[in-house]
Protein backbone atom coordinates (compact mmCIF):
# COMPACT_ATOMS: atom_id res chain seq x y z
CA UNK A 1 0.00 0.00 0.00
CA UNK A 2 1.29 3.38 -1.14
CA UNK A 3 0.59 7.04 -1.46
CA UNK A 4 -1.07 7.60 -5.03
CA UNK A 5 0.56 8.24 -7.47
CA UNK A 6 0.59 12.22 -9.30
CA UNK A 7 -2.62 12.76 -11.15
CA UNK A 8 -2.69 15.32 -14.37
CA UNK A 9 -4.44 17.62 -15.79
CA UNK A 10 -4.79 16.77 -19.06
CA UNK A 11 -7.59 18.90 -21.02
CA UNK A 12 -9.42 22.01 -20.33
CA UNK A 13 -12.49 22.75 -22.89
CA UNK A 14 -14.74 25.75 -23.19
CA UNK A 15 -17.76 25.67 -25.56
CA UNK A 16 -18.05 29.30 -25.11
CA UNK A 17 -16.23 30.94 -22.80
CA UNK A 18 -18.74 31.66 -21.22
CA UNK A 19 -18.12 27.83 -19.09
CA UNK A 20 -15.56 25.48 -19.07
CA UNK A 21 -14.40 22.39 -18.07
CA UNK A 22 -11.27 20.50 -16.96
CA UNK A 23 -10.63 16.32 -17.02
CA UNK A 24 -7.74 15.21 -14.81
CA UNK A 25 -6.26 11.42 -15.19
CA UNK A 26 -5.97 9.69 -12.01
CA UNK A 27 -1.90 8.64 -11.08
CA UNK A 28 -1.87 5.17 -9.81
CA UNK A 29 -4.46 4.39 -6.76
CA UNK A 30 -1.47 2.62 -4.33
CA UNK A 31 -4.01 0.00 -3.44
CA UNK A 32 -6.28 2.19 -1.44
CA UNK A 33 -9.38 4.25 -1.72
CA UNK A 34 -8.19 7.69 -3.29
CA UNK A 35 -9.87 10.92 -3.29
CA UNK A 36 -9.25 13.51 -5.85
CA UNK A 37 -9.83 17.57 -5.20
CA UNK A 38 -8.88 20.21 -7.65
CA UNK A 39 -7.86 23.48 -5.99
CA UNK A 40 -7.01 26.88 -8.27
CA UNK A 41 -6.85 30.87 -7.75
CA UNK A 42 -7.17 33.21 -10.09
CA UNK A 43 -4.39 35.78 -11.28
CA UNK A 44 -3.60 38.05 -9.00
CA UNK A 45 -5.04 36.43 -6.27
CA UNK A 46 -3.38 34.13 -3.32
CA UNK A 47 -6.64 32.75 -1.89
CA UNK A 48 -6.98 29.03 -3.10
CA UNK A 49 -10.48 27.91 -4.09
CA UNK A 50 -12.14 24.28 -4.70
CA UNK A 51 -13.75 23.03 -8.07
CA UNK A 52 -17.33 24.19 -7.82
CA UNK A 53 -18.80 21.30 -9.82
CA UNK A 54 -17.42 17.93 -9.54
CA UNK A 55 -20.68 16.80 -11.34
CA UNK A 56 -21.09 18.08 -14.74
CA UNK A 57 -18.17 17.01 -16.67
CA UNK A 58 -18.44 13.47 -15.41
CA UNK A 59 -15.55 11.10 -14.00
CA UNK A 60 -12.56 12.99 -12.79
CA UNK A 61 -13.91 16.39 -14.14
CA UNK A 62 -14.31 20.01 -12.35
CA UNK A 63 -16.93 22.23 -14.24
CA UNK A 64 -16.77 25.63 -13.88
CA UNK A 65 -20.42 27.59 -14.43
CA UNK A 66 -20.81 31.11 -15.96
CA UNK A 67 -20.52 32.40 -12.63
CA UNK A 68 -17.31 30.69 -12.00
CA UNK A 69 -15.70 31.60 -15.21
CA UNK A 70 -14.02 34.74 -16.44
CA UNK A 71 -12.23 35.68 -19.65
CA UNK A 72 -9.86 37.92 -18.24
CA UNK A 73 -8.16 36.02 -15.43
CA UNK A 74 -5.76 33.16 -15.80
CA UNK A 75 -6.75 30.65 -13.29
CA UNK A 76 -3.82 28.51 -11.92
CA UNK A 77 -5.10 25.16 -11.18
CA UNK A 78 -3.81 21.58 -9.51
CA UNK A 79 -5.26 18.48 -8.61
CA UNK A 80 -4.58 16.80 -4.93
CA UNK A 81 -4.43 12.63 -5.03
CA UNK A 82 -4.74 11.70 -1.55
CA UNK A 83 -5.43 7.80 0.63
CA UNK A 84 -4.74 7.28 3.58
CA UNK A 85 -0.82 6.60 2.88
CA UNK A 86 -0.02 10.35 2.16
CA UNK A 87 -0.99 12.68 -0.80
CA UNK A 88 -0.01 13.49 -4.19
CA UNK A 89 0.15 16.57 -6.80
CA UNK A 90 -0.40 17.19 -10.40
CA UNK A 91 1.61 20.26 -12.06
CA UNK A 92 0.51 23.36 -11.81
CA UNK A 93 -1.66 24.42 -14.79
CA UNK A 94 -2.64 27.62 -16.38
CA UNK A 95 -5.80 28.17 -18.36
CA UNK A 96 -6.71 31.21 -19.98
CA UNK A 97 -10.60 30.25 -21.18
CA UNK A 98 -9.56 32.13 -24.76
CA UNK A 99 -7.23 29.62 -25.47
CA UNK A 100 -9.34 26.67 -24.84
CA UNK A 101 -12.66 27.15 -26.51
CA UNK A 102 -13.88 23.95 -29.22
CA UNK A 103 -17.10 25.61 -30.03
CA UNK A 104 -20.19 22.96 -31.44
CA UNK A 105 -20.16 22.18 -34.73
CA UNK A 106 -21.64 24.85 -37.27
CA UNK A 107 -25.24 23.93 -38.23
CA UNK A 108 -27.67 24.38 -41.38
CA UNK A 109 -25.42 23.15 -43.59
CA UNK A 110 -27.30 23.20 -46.64
CA UNK A 111 -25.98 22.41 -50.25
CA UNK A 112 -26.95 22.71 -53.54
CA UNK A 113 -25.83 22.13 -57.07
CA UNK A 114 -26.51 25.05 -58.80
CA UNK A 115 -26.45 25.16 -62.77
CA UNK A 116 -26.43 28.88 -64.11
CA UNK A 117 -27.16 29.27 -67.80
CA UNK A 118 -24.35 31.72 -68.63
CA UNK A 119 -21.17 29.87 -66.15
CA UNK A 120 -20.47 26.33 -65.37
CA UNK A 121 -22.31 24.85 -62.66
CA UNK A 122 -21.01 24.45 -59.34
CA UNK A 123 -21.83 23.32 -55.62
CA UNK A 124 -22.53 26.00 -53.90
CA UNK A 125 -22.91 25.17 -49.63
CA UNK A 126 -24.02 27.59 -46.69
CA UNK A 127 -24.09 26.70 -42.91
CA UNK A 128 -24.60 28.80 -39.71
CA UNK A 129 -22.17 29.00 -36.46
CA UNK A 130 -23.32 27.24 -33.29
CA UNK A 131 -25.81 29.09 -31.67
CA UNK A 132 -23.73 29.32 -28.54
CA UNK A 133 -21.05 31.27 -30.13
CA UNK A 134 -21.23 34.79 -29.69
CA UNK A 135 -19.70 36.64 -32.79
CA UNK A 136 -21.34 40.30 -32.29
CA UNK A 137 -18.94 41.36 -29.96
CA UNK A 138 -16.06 40.47 -31.57
CA UNK A 139 -14.51 38.72 -28.68
CA UNK A 140 -14.44 35.25 -31.47
CA UNK A 141 -13.34 35.28 -34.84
CA UNK A 142 -14.74 31.86 -36.36
CA UNK A 143 -12.83 29.87 -38.99
CA UNK A 144 -14.30 27.32 -41.43
CA UNK A 145 -13.05 24.41 -43.21
CA UNK A 146 -15.16 22.09 -45.48
CA UNK A 147 -14.41 18.40 -46.38
CA UNK A 148 -16.33 16.84 -48.88
CA UNK A 149 -16.12 12.58 -50.61
CA UNK A 150 -17.83 11.01 -53.14
CA UNK A 151 -19.81 8.46 -51.04
CA UNK A 152 -17.89 5.33 -51.91
CA UNK A 153 -14.52 7.05 -51.66
CA UNK A 154 -11.67 6.77 -49.10
CA UNK A 155 -10.00 10.24 -48.97
CA UNK A 156 -11.85 13.48 -48.76
CA UNK A 157 -11.05 16.75 -49.85
CA UNK A 158 -10.61 19.91 -47.68
CA UNK A 159 -11.24 23.39 -48.38
CA UNK A 160 -10.38 26.40 -45.57
CA UNK A 161 -13.42 29.02 -46.33
CA UNK A 162 -11.51 31.52 -43.81
CA UNK A 163 -14.60 33.28 -41.69
CA UNK A 164 -17.21 33.24 -44.56
CA UNK A 165 -20.43 30.88 -44.54
CA UNK A 166 -20.72 30.07 -47.56
CA UNK A 167 -18.45 27.91 -50.14
CA UNK A 168 -18.24 27.29 -53.78
CA UNK A 169 -16.42 24.52 -55.34
CA UNK A 170 -16.33 23.93 -58.68
CA UNK A 171 -14.61 20.42 -59.60
CA UNK A 172 -16.66 17.30 -59.07
CA UNK A 173 -17.57 14.47 -60.39
CA UNK A 174 -20.99 14.05 -62.69
CA UNK A 175 -23.21 11.31 -61.53
CA UNK A 176 -21.60 10.90 -57.97
CA UNK A 177 -23.06 10.99 -54.69
CA UNK A 178 -21.18 13.20 -52.32
CA UNK A 179 -21.09 13.46 -48.27
CA UNK A 180 -19.90 17.46 -47.09
CA UNK A 181 -19.70 18.50 -43.37
CA UNK A 182 -17.98 21.82 -42.18
CA UNK A 183 -16.15 22.74 -38.83
CA UNK A 184 -15.45 25.64 -37.37
CA UNK A 185 -12.40 26.84 -35.02
CA UNK A 186 -11.68 30.05 -33.13
CA UNK A 187 -8.86 32.12 -33.82
CA UNK A 188 -6.97 30.47 -30.60
CA UNK A 189 -8.63 27.52 -29.72
CA UNK A 190 -9.63 23.90 -31.08
CA UNK A 191 -11.13 22.44 -34.22
CA UNK A 192 -15.48 21.80 -33.68
CA UNK A 193 -16.28 18.27 -34.27
CA UNK A 194 -17.58 17.68 -38.38
CA UNK A 195 -20.91 18.83 -38.69
CA UNK A 196 -23.59 15.55 -39.11
CA UNK A 197 -23.16 14.77 -43.00
CA UNK A 198 -25.12 16.10 -45.55
CA UNK A 199 -25.78 14.53 -48.97
CA UNK A 200 -26.05 15.63 -52.82
CA UNK A 201 -26.48 13.99 -55.74
CA UNK A 202 -24.33 15.40 -58.67
CA UNK A 203 -26.36 15.46 -61.91
CA UNK A 204 -24.55 13.12 -64.92
CA UNK A 205 -24.60 16.20 -67.21
CA UNK A 206 -22.82 18.31 -64.22
CA UNK A 207 -19.57 19.78 -66.45
CA UNK A 208 -16.57 19.20 -64.81
CA UNK A 209 -14.22 22.46 -64.79
CA UNK A 210 -10.84 22.27 -66.07
CA UNK A 211 -9.00 23.38 -62.70
CA UNK A 212 -9.73 21.70 -59.34
CA UNK A 213 -9.88 24.94 -57.47
CA UNK A 214 -12.97 26.46 -55.43
CA UNK A 215 -14.05 30.23 -55.34
CA UNK A 216 -14.90 31.76 -52.34
CA UNK B 1 7.99 16.10 -14.24
CA UNK B 2 7.65 18.05 -17.90
CA UNK B 3 10.50 17.44 -20.44
CA UNK B 4 11.14 18.64 -23.50
CA UNK B 5 14.34 16.64 -24.96
CA UNK B 6 15.53 18.12 -28.29
CA UNK B 7 17.76 16.18 -30.92
CA UNK B 8 21.59 17.59 -31.48
CA UNK B 9 23.53 19.94 -32.96
CA UNK B 10 23.86 20.42 -36.44
CA UNK B 11 26.07 21.46 -39.03
CA UNK B 12 24.84 22.07 -42.65
CA UNK B 13 25.41 23.56 -46.20
CA UNK B 14 23.68 26.49 -47.34
CA UNK B 15 20.66 25.84 -49.43
CA UNK B 16 20.08 22.40 -47.76
CA UNK B 17 17.96 21.59 -44.99
CA UNK B 18 17.59 20.94 -41.30
CA UNK B 19 15.31 18.59 -39.56
CA UNK B 20 14.82 19.38 -35.18
CA UNK B 21 13.27 17.33 -32.79
CA UNK B 22 11.57 17.66 -29.84
CA UNK B 23 10.78 14.65 -27.44
CA UNK B 24 8.24 15.30 -25.33
CA UNK B 25 7.70 13.68 -21.83
CA UNK B 26 6.01 13.86 -17.91
CA UNK B 27 2.24 14.94 -19.35
CA UNK B 28 0.00 13.94 -22.23
CA UNK B 29 1.25 15.35 -26.05
CA UNK B 30 -2.07 15.95 -27.21
CA UNK B 31 -3.00 18.44 -24.90
CA UNK B 32 -0.43 20.89 -25.30
CA UNK B 33 0.20 23.53 -28.42
CA UNK B 34 4.14 23.30 -28.93
CA UNK B 35 6.23 26.25 -30.68
CA UNK B 36 9.37 26.50 -32.14
CA UNK B 37 11.48 29.78 -30.93
CA UNK B 38 14.82 30.45 -32.20
CA UNK B 39 18.06 32.67 -31.50
CA UNK B 40 20.54 34.07 -33.47
CA UNK B 41 24.21 34.20 -31.73
CA UNK B 42 24.34 37.23 -29.19
CA UNK B 43 20.87 38.07 -30.82
CA UNK B 44 17.28 38.19 -29.16
CA UNK B 45 14.13 35.33 -29.36
CA UNK B 46 12.34 34.44 -32.62
CA UNK B 47 8.65 33.17 -32.46
CA UNK B 48 8.93 30.75 -35.28
CA UNK B 49 5.45 28.96 -35.61
CA UNK B 50 3.56 26.38 -33.39
CA UNK B 51 1.60 23.01 -34.19
CA UNK B 52 -1.41 21.16 -32.09
CA UNK B 53 -0.47 18.14 -32.17
CA UNK B 54 -4.05 17.01 -31.03
CA UNK B 55 -5.13 17.78 -35.03
CA UNK B 56 -1.68 18.47 -36.63
CA UNK B 57 -3.19 22.87 -36.62
CA UNK B 58 -0.11 24.92 -37.27
CA UNK B 59 0.42 28.53 -37.59
CA UNK B 60 3.50 29.92 -38.86
CA UNK B 61 5.67 33.70 -38.63
CA UNK B 62 5.00 34.43 -42.56
CA UNK B 63 8.82 35.70 -42.01
CA UNK B 64 9.84 32.60 -43.04
CA UNK B 65 7.24 32.60 -45.99
CA UNK B 66 7.55 28.16 -46.17
CA UNK B 67 10.52 27.67 -45.45
CA UNK B 68 9.25 26.35 -42.13
CA UNK B 69 7.58 23.30 -41.58
CA UNK B 70 6.12 21.75 -38.10
CA UNK B 71 5.19 18.21 -37.56
CA UNK B 72 4.24 15.69 -34.74
CA UNK B 73 4.27 12.28 -34.04
CA UNK B 74 1.22 11.03 -31.54
CA UNK B 75 3.49 7.74 -31.00
CA UNK B 76 6.51 8.87 -30.08
CA UNK B 77 4.97 12.24 -28.43
CA UNK B 78 7.78 13.94 -30.51
CA UNK B 79 7.83 17.28 -32.29
CA UNK B 80 9.68 18.59 -35.52
CA UNK B 81 10.76 21.30 -36.85
CA UNK B 82 12.04 21.39 -40.33
CA UNK B 83 13.57 24.58 -42.38
CA UNK B 84 14.67 24.52 -45.83
CA UNK B 85 16.80 26.56 -48.19
CA UNK B 86 18.86 27.41 -45.40
CA UNK B 87 20.94 30.55 -45.33
CA UNK B 88 24.05 31.72 -42.70
CA UNK B 89 22.01 34.04 -41.01
CA UNK B 90 20.02 30.98 -39.76
CA UNK B 91 22.70 30.31 -37.82
CA UNK B 92 21.23 29.49 -34.49
CA UNK B 93 19.89 27.64 -31.20
CA UNK B 94 16.44 26.59 -32.07
CA UNK B 95 13.83 26.02 -29.18
CA UNK B 96 11.09 23.98 -28.80
CA UNK B 97 9.03 25.61 -25.84
CA UNK B 98 5.52 24.30 -24.83
CA UNK B 99 2.26 26.62 -23.20
CA UNK B 100 -0.19 25.41 -20.93
CA UNK B 101 -3.34 26.63 -22.12
CA UNK B 102 -2.55 30.26 -22.23
CA UNK B 103 0.20 32.53 -24.65
CA UNK B 104 3.15 32.28 -22.97
CA UNK B 105 5.90 29.61 -22.86
CA UNK B 106 5.90 27.38 -19.72
CA UNK B 107 8.42 24.87 -20.84
CA UNK B 108 11.48 25.05 -23.51
CA UNK B 109 13.90 22.50 -24.48
CA UNK B 110 17.78 22.55 -24.11
CA UNK B 111 18.02 24.02 -27.29
CA UNK B 112 19.78 22.83 -30.62
CA UNK B 113 22.43 24.84 -32.03
CA UNK B 114 21.84 24.61 -36.09
CA UNK B 115 25.57 26.01 -37.81
CA UNK B 116 24.84 27.18 -41.14
CA UNK B 117 28.19 26.95 -43.26
CA UNK B 118 29.84 26.53 -46.55
CA UNK C 1 5.08 43.31 -36.62
CA UNK C 2 4.36 44.81 -33.43
CA UNK C 3 8.18 45.50 -32.76
CA UNK C 4 9.31 45.51 -28.74
CA UNK C 5 12.18 48.32 -27.64
CA UNK C 6 13.85 47.25 -24.46
CA UNK C 7 16.02 49.62 -22.31
CA UNK C 8 18.64 49.51 -21.68
CA UNK C 9 20.53 47.24 -23.22
CA UNK C 10 23.06 46.09 -20.19
CA UNK C 11 22.54 47.03 -16.55
CA UNK C 12 25.56 46.71 -13.82
CA UNK C 13 24.11 46.43 -10.33
CA UNK C 14 25.01 46.25 -6.94
CA UNK C 15 23.76 43.36 -4.77
CA UNK C 16 20.85 44.49 -2.77
CA UNK C 17 20.41 47.52 -5.02
CA UNK C 18 17.27 47.82 -7.49
CA UNK C 19 16.86 47.62 -11.16
CA UNK C 20 14.30 48.62 -13.33
CA UNK C 21 14.05 47.64 -17.59
CA UNK C 22 11.77 49.79 -19.75
CA UNK C 23 9.54 48.10 -22.72
CA UNK C 24 8.06 49.64 -25.40
CA UNK C 25 5.84 48.25 -28.47
CA UNK C 26 5.26 49.72 -31.28
CA UNK C 27 1.32 49.12 -31.14
CA UNK C 28 -0.72 48.67 -28.00
CA UNK C 29 -1.09 44.88 -26.08
CA UNK C 30 -4.52 45.03 -25.75
CA UNK C 31 -6.24 42.01 -27.09
CA UNK C 32 -9.94 42.05 -28.31
CA UNK C 33 -10.47 39.47 -25.00
CA UNK C 34 -9.14 42.77 -22.99
CA UNK C 35 -6.12 40.59 -21.38
CA UNK C 36 -2.79 42.48 -21.96
CA UNK C 37 -0.32 39.48 -23.13
CA UNK C 38 3.23 40.82 -22.33
CA UNK C 39 5.39 38.75 -20.51
CA UNK C 40 8.96 38.88 -19.08
CA UNK C 41 11.32 36.32 -19.10
CA UNK C 42 14.98 35.37 -18.01
CA UNK C 43 17.80 33.76 -19.78
CA UNK C 44 20.32 32.69 -17.58
CA UNK C 45 24.01 31.83 -19.14
CA UNK C 46 24.48 28.82 -20.80
CA UNK C 47 20.33 28.21 -20.16
CA UNK C 48 16.86 28.44 -21.64
CA UNK C 49 14.83 31.08 -20.88
CA UNK C 50 11.95 30.89 -18.21
CA UNK C 51 9.41 32.78 -17.58
CA UNK C 52 9.08 35.51 -14.63
CA UNK C 53 6.01 37.64 -15.32
CA UNK C 54 2.95 36.85 -17.33
CA UNK C 55 0.39 39.03 -18.39
CA UNK C 56 1.85 42.57 -17.61
CA UNK C 57 2.54 41.78 -13.77
CA UNK C 58 1.71 38.21 -12.98
CA UNK C 59 4.61 36.45 -11.10
CA UNK C 60 5.24 33.11 -12.49
CA UNK C 61 4.99 30.10 -10.07
CA UNK C 62 8.30 29.91 -7.85
CA UNK C 63 9.51 33.30 -9.26
CA UNK C 64 10.27 35.34 -5.92
CA UNK C 65 8.80 38.64 -4.63
CA UNK C 66 11.47 40.67 -5.89
CA UNK C 67 10.40 40.47 -9.15
CA UNK C 68 7.38 43.00 -10.11
CA UNK C 69 6.23 44.17 -13.50
CA UNK C 70 3.88 47.15 -14.35
CA UNK C 71 2.78 48.94 -17.18
CA UNK C 72 0.15 49.54 -19.80
CA UNK C 73 -1.03 49.89 -23.67
CA UNK C 74 2.76 49.98 -24.90
CA UNK C 75 4.97 51.14 -22.10
CA UNK C 76 6.22 48.26 -19.61
CA UNK C 77 8.57 48.07 -16.63
CA UNK C 78 10.26 44.96 -15.01
CA UNK C 79 11.63 45.74 -11.83
CA UNK C 80 13.66 44.10 -9.28
CA UNK C 81 13.23 45.53 -5.84
CA UNK C 82 16.94 43.90 -4.62
CA UNK C 83 19.17 42.43 -7.12
CA UNK C 84 20.82 39.45 -6.50
CA UNK C 85 23.83 37.29 -7.77
CA UNK C 86 21.47 34.56 -9.34
CA UNK C 87 19.58 37.20 -11.68
CA UNK C 88 22.00 37.65 -13.98
CA UNK C 89 21.17 36.63 -17.26
CA UNK C 90 19.28 38.40 -19.91
CA UNK C 91 15.85 39.45 -19.38
CA UNK C 92 13.85 39.90 -22.30
CA UNK C 93 10.24 40.98 -22.78
CA UNK C 94 7.34 39.68 -25.54
CA UNK C 95 4.23 40.69 -26.41
CA UNK C 96 1.70 37.05 -27.76
CA UNK C 97 -1.58 39.40 -28.30
CA UNK C 98 -0.58 39.67 -31.83
CA UNK C 99 1.08 37.30 -34.08
CA UNK C 100 3.56 36.65 -34.86
CA UNK C 101 4.50 36.61 -31.25
CA UNK C 102 7.31 38.73 -30.86
CA UNK C 103 10.17 39.50 -28.15
CA UNK C 104 12.15 42.41 -27.32
CA UNK C 105 16.10 42.53 -27.95
CA UNK C 106 17.35 41.75 -24.27
CA UNK C 107 18.51 43.74 -21.56
CA UNK C 108 21.64 41.99 -19.78
CA UNK C 109 21.71 42.35 -15.92
CA UNK C 110 25.54 42.03 -14.56
CA UNK C 111 27.11 42.26 -11.45
CA UNK C 112 28.99 45.01 -10.06
Known amino acids: QLPPGKPEIFKCRSPNKETFTCWWRPGTDGGLPTNYSLTYHREGETLMHECPDYITGGPNSCHFGKQYTSMWRTYVMMVNATNQMGSSFSDELYVDVTYIVQPDPPLELTVEVKQPEDRKPYLWMKWSPPTLIDLKTGWFTLLYEIRLKPEKAAEWETHFAGQQTEFKILSLHPGQKYLVQVRCKPDHGYWSAWSPATFIQIPSDFIMNDHHHHHH | EVQLVQSGAEVKKPGSSVKVSCKAS????????MHWVRQAPGQGLEWMGV????????NYNQKFKGRVTITADESTSTAYMELSSLRSEDTAVYYC???????????WGQGTLVTVSS | DVVMTQTPLSLSVTPGQPASISCRSS???????????LHWYLQKPGQSPQLLIY???NRFSGVPDRFSGSGSGTDFTLKISRVEAEDVGVYYC?????????FGGGTKVEIK
Open chain 2, 97 to 107: ARGDYSNWFTY
Open chain 2, 26 to 33: GYTFTSFW
Open chain 2, 51 to 58: IDPSDTYT
Open chain 3, 27 to 37: QRLVHSNGNTY
Open chain 3, 55 to 57: KVS
Open chain 3, 94 to 102: SQSTHVPWT
